[in-house]
């Protein structure tokens, strides 16, 4: 029975050309984390596995930072980067568990955090 | 089998600058962090920055910029920190330790730093 | 940045006793809490990950526990090895930052 929740940064903005930190938690559960897979709609970001540590998928490698811990950070934003991004988390014996973030790229200089929601 | 090797006890000068390595074997080194942890005698732990090998992306302690310089060669699978201008508060057991996002699971012999004219 | 504070600083215990471990941070850090053993001029050594999780070839004797700004180690029926300092560290958010340490000495 899958009883962890993931609660991630929510709807979030900032500045282009600018960075942001996308983070995910996962709680309630004592099931292992084994790897975690970011991803911005269908794109394979970075992968952070237990045993090999991370992948930054070739087309992000000069624009993705991985950290701080299993979280991932965007660098030089571009308006193109809004959209949805995904962390999904492997995890044994429990299986997958998944969270939403929503990232939107401003021109201006006014970029405000979103509130935290949780996933189940 | 991983294995992070640290070069050897230094003593340097006040105002001198050390440099010092952190070898690793048994794993992709440009897939993990590698951090740098300050130790002074009977004292506790203190982050001073790690280092991305595959980006070469650095993240600093505020504390200890202008002071320590993180560096990596991923062609001979070594981290390198520098100090400068130092002084008796940089006398330490200074770690090179390696993460993956999963805590520092594997840890240098540490590298003994003592400053003294 | 995130200040985690260890108590108690030192834990006088006899072999055989059980004992918990506080660390508390200044903000919530959801369960990115790591604990590490050191013995006298060793390296440190990482025990458990994410406030739970096991390490393998760690003794099973070694169990954590906490989320948000409370976490604590367990230690069942300390042996004489376990003996030496205690570190909790955060990598919720730059920069990583250690607890000032649990000394655990026999009695």
């Known amino acids: 029975m899958m009883t962890g929740t993931i609660e991630t940064t929510g709807n979030i903005s900032a500045e282009k050309g600018g960075s942001i930190i996308l983070q995910c938690h996962l709680s309630s559960t004592t099931a292992q984390v084994t790897q975690v897979n970011w991803e911005q709609q269908d794109q394979l970001l970075a992968i952070c596995n237990a045993d090999l540590g991370w992948h930054i998928s070739p087309s992000f490698k000069d624009r993705v930072a991985p950290g701080p811990g299993l979280g991932l950070t965007l660098q030089s934003l571009t308006v193109n980067d809004t959209g949805e991004y995904f962390c999904i988390y492997h995890t044994y014996p429990d299986g997958t568990y998944t969270g939403r973030i929503f990232l939107e790229v401003l021109e201006s200089s006014v970029a405000e955090h979103g509130a935290r929601f949780q996933i189940p | 089998e991983v294995q992070l090797q640290q070069s050897g006890t230094v003593l340097a000068r006040p105002g001198a600058s050390v440099k010092m390595s952190c070898k690793t074997s048994?794993?992709?080194?440009?897939?993990?962090?590698m951090h740098w942890v300050k130790q002074r005698p009977g004292q506790g732990l203190e982050w001073i920055g790690g280092?991305?090998?595959?980006?070469?992306?650095?993240t600093y302690n505020q504390k200890f910029k202008g002071k320590a310089k993180l560096t990596a060669v991923t062609s001979a699978s070594t981290a390198y920190m520098e100090l400068s201008s130092l002084t008796n508060e940089d006398s330490a057991v200074y770690y090179c330790?390696?993460?993956?996002?999963?805590?520092?699971?594997?840890w240098g012999q540490g590298t003994s730093v003592t400053v003294s004219s | 940045d995130i200040v985690l504070t260890q108590s108690p600083a030192t834990l006088s215990v006899t072999p055989g006793d059980s004992v918990s471990l506080s660390c508390r941070a200044s903000?919530?850090?959801?369960?990115?809490l790591h604990w590490y053993q050191q013995k006298s001029h060793e390296s440190p050594r990482l025990l458990i990950k994410?406030?739970?999780q096991s390490i393998s070839g760690i003794p099973s004797r070694f169990s954590g526990s906490g989320s948000g700004t409370d976490f604590t180690l367990n230690i069942n029926s300390v042996e004489t090895e376990d003996f030496g300092m205690y570190f909790c560290?955060?990598?919720?958010?730059?920069?990583?930052?250690f607890g000032g340490g649990t000394k655990l000495e026999i009695k």
């Open positions: 994410f406030s739970s």
């Open positions: 048994g794993y992709s080194f440009t897939s993990y962090w």
């Open positions: 560290q955060q990598s919720n958010s730059w920069p990583y930052t």
């Open positions: 330790t390696r993460e993956g996002g999963y805590g520092m699971d594997y």
């Open positions: 903000q919530s850090i959801y369960n990115n």
């Open positions: 280092i991305y090998p595959g980006n070469s992306d650095t």
